[in-house]
Interface confidence: low
């Protein structure tokens, strides 16, 4: 699915980091882990030290959107979660610093963060119908829903 063109003129300004060093577990209690330099995957871990720790940065939209817009960075790195297309793996993009302003095609770095009870959803700003998802026998990717798993639990203070 192509990015929504009407979003291209919306500007997102970085505010602050709102969460540090949290773990994402999917509905099967699988944690997101590093697969390699580029991709993430999910695995059932006995030792959460293996799980990726994320930082979450908040952005404010120029159109005063009610949704919370965030960027996801692997803690203690300069790697940022970047959306591709539907059913494609999310990539880890290296950037020297957290972007101060994001607009246009760079919105593939941003996600709308929604919470429903203990369930957390991350919708791609570039592809508003697609979520960060885990999928059996695959990488962490963008998906519209089942059979991919789109809801996550945030585990904090795991240090």
């Amino acid at each position: 699915s192509a990015p929504f063109s009407f979003l291209s003129n919306v500007k997102y300004n970085f505010m602050r980091i709102i969460k540090y060093e949290f773990i994402l577990n999917d509905a099967l209690n699988q944690s997101i882990i590093r697969a390699n330099d580029q991709y993430l995957t999910a695995a059932a871990l006995h030792n959460l030290d293996e799980a990726v720790k994320f930082d979450m940065g908040a952005y404010k939209s120029s159109k005063d959107d009610a949704k919370i817009t965030v960027i996801l960075r692997i803690s203690k790195t300069q790697l940022y979660v970047t959306a591709q297309d539907e059913d494609q793996p999310v990539l880890l993009k290296e950037m020297p610093e957290i972007p101060k302003t994001i607009t246009g095609s760079e919105t593939n770095l941003l996600f709308f963060w929604e919470t429903h009870g203990t369930k957390n959803y991350f919708t791609s700003v570039a592809h508003p119908n697609l979520f960060i998802a885990t999928k059996q026998d695959y990488w962490v990717c963008l998906a519209g829903g089942p059979p991919s798993i789109t809801d996550f639990q945030i585990l904090e203070n795991q240090a």
Epitope: I33, R34, A35, N36, Y39, T41, A43, A44, L45, H46, N47, E50, Q136, D137, Y138
Partner: antibody, heavy 122, light 107 residues
Framework: QVQLVESGGGVVQPGRSLRLSCTAS????????VHWVRQAPGKGLEWVAA????????YYAESVKGRFTISRDNSKNILFLQMDSLRLEDTAVYYC???????????????WGQGTLVTVSS | DIQMTQSPSSVSASVGDRVTITCRAS??????LAWYQQKPGKAPKLLIY???NLETGVPSRFSGSGSGSDFTLTISSLQPEDFATYYC?????????FGGGTKVEIK
């Protein structure tokens, strides 16, 4: 040096079971995902199954799903393949092979055993 | 599942020849492709991983290229010990799969 030694092959009748073992040495077994790959006589390579470094994630080819079970004992450095409901087409040399350290991902297989022959025959 | 198709299935060549083997994936696999060499009665040997990276100890006459769904293994100058069967393998999906193999024979 890295060594993988398969055992447990033999002749078995269709419908029966067989358990293959692969004993690892020369590396920290518990850090690596490991795989079974088979090769029917005169045919190409067919990936069969894989298990993650800690045994928590298992993956199977469609052709063996529900019949074969991969497992590992990290305390003894052994990989297993339990083969049930064997069919004539399961006749092959079975190799164990090592993937990459500490991740549950597909990987090129840099180290292989010498293989063990399983013959399913009535 | 991802299907891997190799061509040709066999090739006859002489020592010193340049040999090219192709591998096509049924869907895009980025650069997640490995090449193996297998001699009769022996286990496969990893030659190239991630499409173009030469495994340690493999002679530089072997090279790999390609990305997406089309890949190539090239032997720049065939040596007597290179007569063998070559397999590609995708390492993109958790369910690994191999190509059908290409037998390099003496002309």
């Amino acid at each position: 040096q890295v060594q993988l030694v398969e055992s447990g092959g033999g002749v078995v009748q269709p419908g029966r079971s067989l358990r293959l073992s692969c004993t690892a040495s020369g590396f920290t077994f518990s850090m690596f995902g490991v795989h079974w790959v088979r090769q029917a006589p005169g045919k190409g390579l067919e990936w069969v199954a894989a298990v993650s470094y800690d045994g928590s994630n298992k993956y199977y080819a469609e052709s063996v799903k529900g019949r074969f079970t991969i497992s590992r004992d990290n305390s003894k450095n052994i990989l297993f393949l339990q083969m049930d409901s064997l069919r004539l087409e399961d006749t092959a040399v079975y190799y164990c092979a090592r993937g990459r350290p500490k991740v549950v991902i597909p990987a090129p297989l840099a180290h292989w055993g010498q293989g063990t022959l399983v013959t399913v025959s009535s | 599942d991802i299907q891997m198709t190799q061509s040709p299935s066999s090739v006859s060549a002489s020592v010193g020849d340049r040999v090219t083997i192709t591998c096509r994936a049924s869907q895009g696999i980025s650069s997640w492709l490995a090449w193996y060499q297998q001699k009769p009665g022996k286990a496969p040997k990893l030659l190239i991983y991630e499409a173009s990276n030469l495994e340690t100890g493999v002679p530089s006459r072997f090279s790999g290229s390609g990305s997406g769904s089309d890949f190539t293994l090239t032997i720049s100058s065939l040596q007597p010990e290179d007569f063998a069967t070559y397999y590609c393998q995708q390492t993109s999906s958790f369910l690994l799969s191999f190509g059908g193999g290409t037998k390099v024979e003496i002309k």
